[in-house]
Interface confidence: low
């Protein structure tokens, strides 16, 4: 009874299409494929950059898988073919790996990337990114922003750079349709009259880096003798109700009373006959329903209510 | 590990010329500026000058300026420091010292090399 | 040129003391949200060793009782606790503007 073996994939590769950390990953049939013509051959593709302790494993009939990786680092990977059981008449049969690796050979010292990278999706509506110069590098330097997602072409420049001393130090980015719940690649390189210049490469999603705007239209009611009913309006924008989270803080007499988060645009605050003097702040940020992650608004205005009956009267703003 | 390894000790007359080495392992050379710093006996210190390893570009502290020639040689990765015109106040000992530029610091030095300047 | 002020330019302190060094510069040395002030310990005989770049960064290896602090042009060094192998000559020195520039010193002794 002959063993039944099969071989690798060919031509393993790993190709960069220039979308900055998006890349692909390329083999063709494994050889003497000719006894199996009735089965359908399986793939099991497993890659990570390098220094990551766990591999992502893929299987696949296709000759082809694509997915972000971090250009900071090398990227390995192996490939070997499945023949599952019903193609042998027993045990599933697998290839030895094929591997290869990528990475783009680093210019300068690490010292010369651009330092503090700091992104900001405003409002959901604009994004703007800035850094700082790399420690030492000289005034000659400059840096250049590129990005990409998938809707793109090819990776494009920052057309709108923030300048200090004639040095670019942020970008503000033009409406980006269709661009979030999607990878975003960044690479901010440079050039030096007489340095190399370490690249920096960036992936995040925009929903994840959103800062709202602050909560308006603050206003307390009576709702009784012991109860206020604290309630503010969501901030002009794209960004829907339901998305928010707020955290509240609360001062009663110049002391601070209570802080809490909620999820909608009320809070309702036990009082006593003593307070003289009550003021509360609010702020936004995208809650767990739209977004992994998220930036805290700035504080709403004050909004404070000294001395007198609240069932009068209702404060706005 | 990161090494600077200077020349041995001089003596020179007055007027004439002296020419320090400094040779660099453990670190892409070319990656780095070279600094020289000068240091009197029980005095502070002074910076003389920084050459690029990668371009040659040099920069001199204008005092230097005119009597000390900042030279590399990529090929063995030594740097040196060539002092013309030497006169008694130049008796002092030469650092050379690595940095990448400006904020980064000098931070590896040299052994240090002393001059005497006696007729 | 800048010119780097340090003081005290001696003092006298004892193991498990905290020493505090302080430089001021002629005009301040910050660009780019970096503050371009490196300080260095010197012992007699030996080469200077980076302590602190960047005004706040550590170099690499050194203990963490050093640190630094300030921007501008009021910089501080701080030892928060002596050790035997601290008693040094310090100096700061200002790498914004050629020609880079260094403070007199402040030679710290045991007491």
């Known amino acids: 009874d002959t063993e039944i073996k099969v071989n690798p994939p060919q031509d393993f590769e790993i190709v960069d299409p220039g979308y900055l950390g998006y890349l692909y990953l390329q083999w063709q049939p494994p050889l003497s494929l000719d006894h199996f013509k009735e089965c359908t051959v399986e793939y099991e593709l497993k890659y990570r950059n390098i220094g990551s302790e766990t591999w992502k494993t893929i299987i696949t009939k296709n000759l082809h898988y694509k997915d972000g990786f971090d250009l900071n680092k090398g990227i390995e990977a192996k490939i070997h073919t499945l023949l599952p059981w019903q193609c042998t008449n027993g045990s599933e049969v697998q290839s030895s790996w094929a591997e290869t690796t990528y990475w783009i050979s680093p210019q300068g010292i690490p010292e010369t990337k651009v330092q503090d990278m700091d992104c900001v999706y405003y409002n959901w509506q604009y994004l703007l990114c800035s850094w700082k110069p790399g420690i030492g590098v000289l005034l000659d330097t400059n840096y250049n922003l590129f990005y990409w997602y998938e809707g793109l072409d090819h990776a494009l420049q920052c057309v709108d750079y923030i300048k200090a001393d004639g040095q670019n130090i942020g970008c503000r980015f033009p409406y980006l349709e269709a661009s979030d719940y999607k990878d975003f690649y960044i690479c901010v390189n440079g050039s030096s009259e007489n340095k190399p210049i370490r690249s920096s490469y960036f992936t995040f999603q925009l929903q994840n880096i959103v800062k709202p705007l602050p909560p308006v239209y603050l206003t307390f009611t009576r709702e009784s003798s012991c109860e206020i009913k604290l309630k503010w309006s969501i901030p002009l924008g794209p960004i829907p109700a339901r998305c928010f989270d707020y955290e509240i803080e609360i001062r009663e007499d110049d002391t601070t009373l209570v802080t809490a988060t909620v999820e909608n645009e009320t809070y309702t605050l036990k009082t006593t006959n003593e307070t003289r003097q009550l003021c509360f702040v609010v702020r936004s940020k995208v809650n767990i329903y739209c977004s992994d992650d998220g930036i805290w608004s700035e504080w709403s205005d004050k909004q404070c209510w000294e001395g007198e009956d609240l069932s009068k009267k209702t404060l706005l703003r | 590990q990161v090494q600077l390894v200077q020349s041995g000790a001089e003596v020179v007359k007055p007027g004439a010329s002296v020419k320090l080495s400094c040779k660099a392992s453990?670190?892409?050379?070319?990656?780095?500026?070279m600094n020289w710093v000068k240091q009197r006996p029980g005095q502070g210190l002074e910076w003389i000058g920084r050459?690029?390893?990668?371009?040659?570009?040099?920069h001199y502290n204008q005092k230097f300026k005119d009597r000390a020639i900042l030279t590399v040689d990529k090929s063995t990765s030594t740097a040196y420091m060539e002092l013309r015109s030497l006169r008694s106040e130049d008796t002092a000992v030469y650092y050379c010292a690595r940095g990448y530029g400006d904020a980064y610091g000098m931070d590896h030095w040299g052994q240090g090399t002393l001059v005497t300047v006696s007729s | 040129d800048i010119v780097l002020t340090q003081s005290p330019s001696s003092l006298s302190a004892s193991v498990g003391d905290r020493a505090t060094i302080t430089c001021r510069a002629s005009e301040s040395v910050d660009n780019y949200g970096i503050s371009f002030m490196n300080w260095f310990q010197q012992k007699p005989g030996k080469p200077p060793k980076l302590l602190i770049y960047?005004?706040?960064r550590q170099g690499s290896g050194d203990p963490a009782r050093f640190s630094g602090s300030g921007s501008g042009t009021d910089f501080t060094l701080t030892i928060s606790s002596l050790q035997p192998e601290d008693f040094a000559t310090y100096f700061c020195?200002?790498?914004?503007?050629?020609?880079?520039?260094f403070g007199g010193g402040t030679k710290l002794e045991i007491k």
């Open positions: 960047a005004a706040s």
């Open positions: 453990g670190y892409t050379f070319t990656n780095y500026w």
């Open positions: 050459i690029d390893a990668y371009a040659g570009e040099t």
């Open positions: 020195q200002q790498s914004k503007e050629v020609p880079w520039t």
